[in-house]
């Protein structure tokens, strides 16, 4: 198995992590996709997932996590808004393809969130916390948990990540179709 690689992103509290995970267009377009945190000992845990089948350009918000699957571009966009120091950890995008193992989209994201300096745009928590006030619903999780080791047989597409401050974020207050999709770091 190929060694798992990771990209490190250092952000300030209040900023937004914006990750684009590329995938093969036709093959995985409607497959359910998920954002996971990696616990100690290679134990991924799902934090949020798209619907099943995954809808095109349809935002799914789970707390401060927003997933958007762009079928036409073959990418899953993951945003974690209003970042907190406790969000620091190792994350990955995966595509569910039961009964087979989930397909992991490289690279893993090593997120390091530090305290912002007062007065800097990235440290203004209030600029995002009211925009993303959609609580999770309480229906049973739709995301299955796959626990097999993440092995890779070929070099998968690379994921890319951008960062932005709260001021550049899109207001998602009218996102109503929220999928409730659990977590260790």
């Amino acid at each position: 198995a190929t060694k798992l690689t990771e990209e490190k992103y250092e952000l300030k509290e209040g900023q937004t992590l914006d990750v684009k995970c590329d995938y093969t267009l036709e093959k995985f377009a409607s497959s359910q996709k998920a954002w996971q945190i990696i616990r100690d000992g290679e134990m991924p845990k799902t934090l949020a997932c798209t619907e099943r089948p995954s809808k095109n350009s349809h935002p799914v918000q789970v707390g401060r996590i927003i997933l958007e699957d762009y079928h036409d571009h073959g990418l899953l966009r993951v945003r974690m808004v209003n970042l907190q120091v406790e969000d620091s950890g190792l994350y990955q995008c995966v595509i569910y393809q039961p009964p087979k193992e989930p397909h992991m989209l490289f690279d893993r994201i090593r997120l390091v969130v530090t305290k912002g300096f007062s007065g800097t745009p990235g440290s203004n928590e209030n600029s995002t916390q009211n925009v993303y006030k959609i609580p999770p619903t309480t229906t049973k999780a739709l995301c299955p948990l796959y626990t097999s080791p993440r092995t890779v047989t070929q070099a998968p597409p690379k994921s890319t990540a951008d960062v932005s401050t709260p001021d550049s974020e899109i207001n998602l207050t009218n996102v109503t179709d929220i999928i409730r999709v659990p977590v260790f770091n």
């Epitope: 290679e42 406790e86 609580p135 995301c143 626990t147 999709v181 977590v183 260790f184």
Partner: antibody
Framework: QVQLVQSGAEVKKPGASVKVSCKAS????????MHWVRQAPGQGLEWMGV????????SYAQKFQGRVTMTRDTSTSTVYMELSSLRSEDTAVYYC?????????????WGQGTLVTVSS | DIVMTQSPLSLPVTPGEPASISCRSS???????????LDWYLQKPGQSPQLLIY???NRASGVPDRFSGSGSGTDFTLKISRVEAEDVGVYYC?????????FGGGTKVEIK
Amino acid sequence: QVQLVQSGAEVKKPGASVKVSCKASGYTFTSYYMHWVRQAPGQGLEWMGVINPSGGSTSYAQKFQGRVTMTRDTSTSTVYMELSSLRSEDTAVYYCARESDGIDSYFDYWGQGTLVTVSS
Amino acid sequence: DIVMTQSPLSLPVTPGEPASISCRSSQSLLHSNGYNYLDWYLQKPGQSPQLLIYLGSNRASGVPDRFSGSGSGTDFTLKISRVEAEDVGVYYCVQARQTPLTFGGGTKVEIK
């Protein structure tokens, strides 16, 4: 239905090792993480670690690092917890507990417990 | 490690009366997905623990509706609206926000 059946009580001498088993049935064994939690007599619950039954990877509490080994046998749907260099403070009931799937990180099924007594 | 502090240590109750147990964590248990990773278990005498509440406020399947969980971040409460004799045992909160998982010290509920 889901069942976790643990091995019987053990009496060990200080310095020895003990290996407790937990046989799972009623679900897909490799699809759920399995944790080990112990409880000393009259005391509270203490998390020891977790094993991924599919890949066999593990994560242990710092306190038990170097003394505990968690393994699994997928052919028999059994997980094992071995604790070495036993001391009297290790006298406890040891539980295996299955972690729920999806987002909900709770223990939905527990074994009946295995009493391990460490005494000279 | 996250430290979980439960109170009271012991709670003598009268059947039919309400009861409340508090649990505090040294760090926030609220994850980025909006869920509080705090669960409540009841361990009846001579039995394995059983799940009551998960993710802070969700009642587990088969748990009577007299049990409710509330709170967010670092402060959580388990409430029993009307205690029944079968509710005696030790109640534990546990955080599943990060490894190592850590349990509260337990609250022993007994009938007066």
